[in-house]
């Protein structure tokens, strides 16, 4: 679809005569009829197959035709067509004299024709005007012409329809040849596909408008290149969505069980050595001088009452020191400066000299004791209660109040320790006088069968594709650390065949 445009510029009829030679009275009031048709080697009368147009009276005899395209579209003359421009044409331009106002052919006398020109040839679509001048014996016509495409039509023959748009159906403008030119941020045959944010993951991300990156289910991050771990995953990561692969030192389905309590919590105090002993449990090995589950209690060397003869004990950095009462000396106040002459024995005790009178010893009557028979007999002084039992004086006798888990006159017997199933990994528990004993199954050792003896689960080389094999001490089984590009418990699957998920 396009328009053949004809711009009339100047017509000269100096003598003011018709084609017959007869002069016009009072002058030739001139208008033009234009016929556009298909190419003919010899232009002949007949239908104007490409269109025709007439002008009003433009002047008398000789005149210049002004450009009137802005004031009504009469010059240039427009001959629109709605077919593919063939590139060739025939053009007939007739100048007529109008004696009155009616310009219809049937209203004109047959000899009102002033002049007639006919041309034919090739004409390519383009913006440039072709200038031409046709002269006869009495007249001269100067004009120019061109073919341009209608709005939204493009190409060498105006056959390509292209209407720029910026909506759901496309985002483009039209190039001179009619091809689409996508607006910035759009691509595809009809420029309907937005160009996502640079770096947005091809599979895991998408966009509905340019420079956007929306994530598909299971993916997150600005570029949708981070998988979302399984809901509830605590100390784990993923390589594909909804996984939970535990970080070092964590276990359980949701990686919420601390397999490395020692490192994560440092529970052992005072330089003690910490050993992990399973999920959320540990054992502290105390340095000398410390006790308690976490080695948090300092052992006092005075707890054993080393000072004799009423000496008082003081704890020191490097041990203890006895402050002796008057008349005694020595590391433990064990030596006396008194003799029998000083009557040192109380409560009827009898004195015996020793070391040629340098020291003495008291023989005490019943119910009294002490180096000077100064103390009433306390039946609890010998610490007869075992296992931390509390000794209670009951007149001439005594009794032991036992700590939970112990029984017997002296708290010497354990209540069955095996009731708590203390032996790990299927160990068999035996109650003994001194406590309990675990008989461990093959592959385990330690007081509670908590130590797994090393089993090389990797001996059979179970891992494929040059994977590194580790023995998992918590299960006696192998764990394959896959090289890049392989997955599976034995690294047997290439990543190109990813596991599929039920959802």
């Amino acid at each position: 679809s396009g328009v053949f445009q004809l711009q009339l510029q100047e017509f000269v009829n100096e003598r003011g005569v018709l084609a017959s030679g007869r002069p016009c009275e009072p002058g030739c009031r001139t208008f033009f009829r234009v016929c556009l048709k298909h190419f003919q080697a010899v232009v002949s009368p007949g239908p104007c197959t490409f269109g025709s147009v007439s002008t009003p009276v433009l002047g008398t005899n000789s005149f210049a035709v002004r450009d009137d395209s802005s004031g009504g579209g009469r010059n240039p003359l427009q001959l629109p067509f709605n077919f593919t421009w063939p590139g060739t044409f025939s053009l007939i331009i007739e100048a007529w004299h109008a004696p009155g106002d009616d310009l219809r052919p049937e209203a004109l006398p047959p000899d009102a024709l002033i002049s007639k020109i006919a041309i034919q040839g090739s004409l390519a679509v383009g913006q440039n005007w072709l200038l031409d001048e046709q002269t006869s014996t009495l007249t001269r016509l100067r004009y120019s012409y061109r073919v341009i495409c209608s709005d939204n039509y493009y190409g060498d023959n105006c056959s390509r329809l292209c209407k720029k748009r910026n909506d759901h159906f496309g985002h483009y403008v039209c190039q001179p040849d009619g091809n689409l030119s996508c607006l910035p941020g759009w691509t595809g045959e009809y420029c309907q596909q937005p160009i996502c944010l640079s770096g947005c993951h091809e599979q895991n991300g998408y966009c509905s408008k340019p420079a956007e990156c929306l994530c598909r289910p299971g993916w997150q991050g600005r570029l949708c290149n981070e998988c979302i771990p399984h809901n509830g995953c605590r100390h784990g990561t993923c390589s594909t969505p909804w996984q939970c692969t535990c970080d070092e030192g964590w276990g359980g389905l949701f990686c919420d069980q601390d397999l490395n309590y020692c490192t994560h919590h440092s529970p052992c105090k005072n330089g003690a050595t910490c050993s992990n002993s399973g999920q959320r449990s540990y054992t502290c090995t105390c340095r000398p001088g410390y006790t308690g589950v976490d080695c948090e209690l300092e052992l006092s060397e005075c707890d054993s009452n080393p000072c004799r003869n009423g000496g008082s004990c003081k704890d020191q950095e490097d041990g203890y020191h006895c402050l002796c009462p008057p008349g005694y000396y020595g590391l433990h106040c064990e030596h006396s400066t008194l003799s029998c002459a000083d009557s040192p024995c109380f409560n009827g005790g009898s004195c015996r000299e020793r070391n040629q009178g340098a020291s003495y010893a008291c023989e005490c009557p019943p119910n009294f004791t002490g180096s000077n028979c100064e103390k009433k007999v306390d039946r609890c002084t010998s610490n007869p209660c075992a296992n931390g039992g509390q000794c209670l004086n009951r007149g001439p006798s005594r009794m032991c109040r036992c700590r939970p888990g112990f029984t017997g006159t002296y708290c010497e017997r354990h209540v069955s320790d095996c009731a708590r199933n203390p032996c790990a990994h299927g160990g068999t528990c035996h109650d003994l006088e001194s406590g309990l004993m675990c008989t461990c199954p093959a592959g385990f050792s330690g007081r509670r069968c908590e130590v797994r003896t090393s089993i090389d689960a990797c001996a059979s080389s179970p891992c494929f594709n040059r994977a590194t094999c580790y023995t998992d001490l918590s299960t006696d089984t192998f764990v394959c650390n896959c090289p890049y590009g392989f997955v599976g418990s034995r690294c047997e699957f290439p990543v190109g065949l990813p596991p599929s998920f039920p959802w």
Epitope: T245, C246, W250, C255, D472, T475
Partner: nanobody, 120 residues
Framework: EVQLVESGGGLVQPGGSLRLSCAAS????????IGWFRQAPGKEPEGISC????????YYADSVKGRFTTSRDNAKNTVYLQMNSLKPEDTAVYYC?????????????TGQGTQVTVSS
């Protein structure tokens, strides 16, 4: 293709029992630990038990200790969750999962789940 299919869920009265099964396919069953977790509406999932590939090591969440037992039959490629003394708070969708390794460390594949409702 790895597949885990749970079955055995249903409606049970408080104090009652149910036995869930998890049938596995698409991988070497003996090589993988298998576990159970559950998710109640509006709550985070809770790992409740896991059994190592050999069956030698089983752990349980404190909330189910003494009531639930997990076992595996490697010949049938199936793991079981025996649930006794059920309580209303045990109501959830129960899922079977595997970390894709021998030890109970994480989740790699999950089943579709089976609904357990404890109500009088």
């Amino acid at each position: 293709e790895v597949q885990l299919v749970e079955s055995g869920g249903g409606l049970v009265q408080p104090g009652g029992s149910l036995r869930l099964s998890c049938a596995a396919s698409g991988f070497t069953f003996d090589d993988y630990a298998i576990g159970w977790f559950r998710q109640a509406p509006g709550k985070e999932p809770e790992g409740i038990s896991c059994i190592s590939s050999s069956g030698g090591i089983t752990y349980y969440a404190d909330s189910v200790k003494g009531r639930f037992t997990t076992s595996r039959d490697n010949a049938k490629n199936t793991v079981y969750l025996q649930m006794n003394s059920l309580k209303p708070e045990d109501t959830a969708v129960y899922y079977c999962a595997t970390p894709g390794i021998a030890a109970c460390r994480g989740i790699h594949y999950t089943g579709q789940g089976t609904q357990v409702t404890v109500s009088s």
